[in-house]
């Protein structure tokens, strides 16, 4: 089957958050379909998303096998209705993706404040540890399991009655901060990997949680 009317994919882009990783590309297919291959620098090519009319392919299952490897993907274009033919020697047009190293490049997902508890003039704020699709012995690992001390959280907190923000940092998932008695505070957290030097160093801020709402507890 010929490939004369097929167009090579372009704008291959990795979209990855907390290691959930999707390769996207253009163009939207007209009379053609795509197959994706992925490999490590030293490994063999593995085909995924066979003859798809989509312009994205979820490669999470492959990259979570070793998030510290560097991966390369390529997208092949075939005529619509293409069936693999053993006699065909003509290589279909394809385009390579940029290299992708999940550990360095996956974006940090928006964190969530799990709880906060006030005891006198101290508030303990706990950040939920997000699960990833990275596995160890058939159990899924959390973001903390994967990044360890590479991952810190920044807490932004302010009195409900004012706009002046204070910050605190932790390399655990907990903050213990001093507050003024009788004041209500609001909180937002951000995940940060300080060792990164790129735009994906920080997550977006968590939703704001304020004292006096259901996530909080107050004890004198």
């Amino acid at each position: 089957s010929g490939t004369t009317n097929t167009v090579a994919a372009y704008n291959l882009t990795w979209k990855s958050t907390n290691f959930k990783t999707i390769l996207e590309w253009e163009p939207k297919p007209i009379n053609q379909v795509y197959t994706v291959q992925i490999s490590t620098k030293s490994g063999d090519w593995k085909s995924k998303c066979f003859y798809t009319a989509d312009t994205e392919c979820d490669l999470t299952d492959e990259i979570v096998k070793d998030v510290k490897q560097t991966y390369l993907a390529r997208v092949f274009s075939y005529p619509a209705g293409h069936v693999e033919s053993t006699g065909s020697t003509e290589e279909p047009p394809y385009e390579n993706s940029p290299e992708f190293t999940p550990y360095l490049e996956t974006n940090l997902g928006q964190p969530t404040i799990q709880s906060f508890e006030q005891v006198g003039t101290k508030v303990n704020v706990t950040v939920q540890d997000e699960w990833t699709l990275v596995r160890r012995n058939d159990t899924f690992l959390s973001l903390r399991d994967v990044f360890g001390k590479d991952l810190i959280y920044t807490l932004y907190y302010w009195k409900s009655s004012s706009s002046g923000k204070k910050t605190a940092k932790t390399n655990t998932n907990e903050f213990l901060i001093d507050v003024d008695k009788g004041e209500n505070y609001c909180f937002s957290v951000q995940a940060v990997i300080p060792s990164r030097r790129t735009a994906n160093r920080k997550s977006t801020d968590s939703p704001v949680e304020c004292m006096g709402h259901e996530k909080g507890e107050s004890r004198e």
Epitope: D66, K68, Q69, T70, T101, Y103, L104, T126, V127, D129, R136, L141, S142, L143, R144, D145, V146, F147, G148, K149, D150, L151, N171, T172, N173, E174, P194, S195, R196, R197, T198
Partner: antibody, heavy 120, light 113 residues
Framework: EVQLVQSGAEVKKPGESLRISCKGS????????IEWVRQMPGKGLEWMGD????????NYNENFKGHVTISADKSISTAYLQWSSLKASDTAMYYC?????????????WGQGTLVTVSS | DIVMTQTPLSLSVTPGQPASISCKSS????????????LTWYLQKPGQPPQLLIY???TRESGVPDRFSGSGSGTDFTLKISRVEAEDVGVYYC?????????FGQGTKLEIK
């Protein structure tokens, strides 16, 4: 097979400069921290600092900050520990090590060590 | 800085007998996020670099014999060798792998009787 190969033994005089190296192979060099550990003669292990070659980010033990510099050249998968002015008290075995795959999972692989002797 | 204190500093054990080393940290090594203790154990055999035995307080590194086991949480940790063998001689170190600066215990020297 993961390997860390360190440069050979050095004999130096106080005040001289020195750079020792640690070449990694058999793994993706940019995504694992390289740790540097000092062991003075007959003594225990002291963590000096580390570097993530992919970004060049470093952490130092305050006891060594300003006296040593940790760097890496990812194009040749090599990390370095250097001194601009050696002291007799720098006489020690220096090990490089590679962090484990998981977060905070120890130093999984070690170099053979570089013996540095500083004497007038 | 987190201070790591090992006891005893030396022990002499008959082959086939058990051995136990204690390690106490000046601050908790328990990560609230994933409930893991970031305490690591190493063995340094004579004339060799250290080798990783146990991480996350109780997870044996690949290839480490199952006679080695780690336990404990928070600030108190123990390394046990169920039946000491001649090849186990050397200095055992615990390490805070929780927060910078990473710190080691003073070491425990194991000898064979």
């Amino acid at each position: 097979e993961v390997q860390l190969v360190q440069s050979g033994a050095e004999v130096k005089k106080p005040g001289e400069s020195l750079r020792i190296s640690c070449k990694g192979s058999g793994y993706t060099f940019i995504t694992y921290w390289i740790e540097w550990v000092r062991q003075m003669p007959g003594k225990g292990l002291e963590w000096m600092g580390d570097i993530l070659p992919g970004s060049g980010s470093t952490n130092y033990n305050e006891n060594f900050k300003g006296h040593v510099t940790i760097s890496a050249d990812k194009s040749i998968s090599t990390a370095y520990l250097q001194w601009s002015s050696l002291k007799a008290s720098d006489t020690a075995m220096y090990y490089c090590a590679r962090s484990g795959y998981y977060g905070n999972s120890g130093f999984a692989y070690w170099g053979q060590g570089t013996l540095v002797t500083v004497s007038s | 800085d987190i201070v790591m204190t090992q006891t005893p500093l030396s022990l002499s054990v008959t082959p086939g007998q058990p051995a136990s080393i204690s390690c106490k940290s000046s601050q908790s090594l328990l990560s609230s996020g994933n409930q893991k203790n970031y305490l690591t154990w190493y063995l340094q055999k004579p004339g060799q670099p250290p080798q990783l035995l146990i991480y996350w307080a109780s997870t044996r590194e690949s290839g480490v014999p199952d006679r080695f086991s780690g336990s404990g949480s928070g600030t108190d940790f123990t390394l046990k060798i169920s039946r000491v063998e001649a090849e186990d001689v050397g200095v055992y170190y615990c390490q805070n792998d929780y927060t910078y600066p990473l710190t080691f215990g003073q070491g425990t020297k194991l000898e064979i009787k």
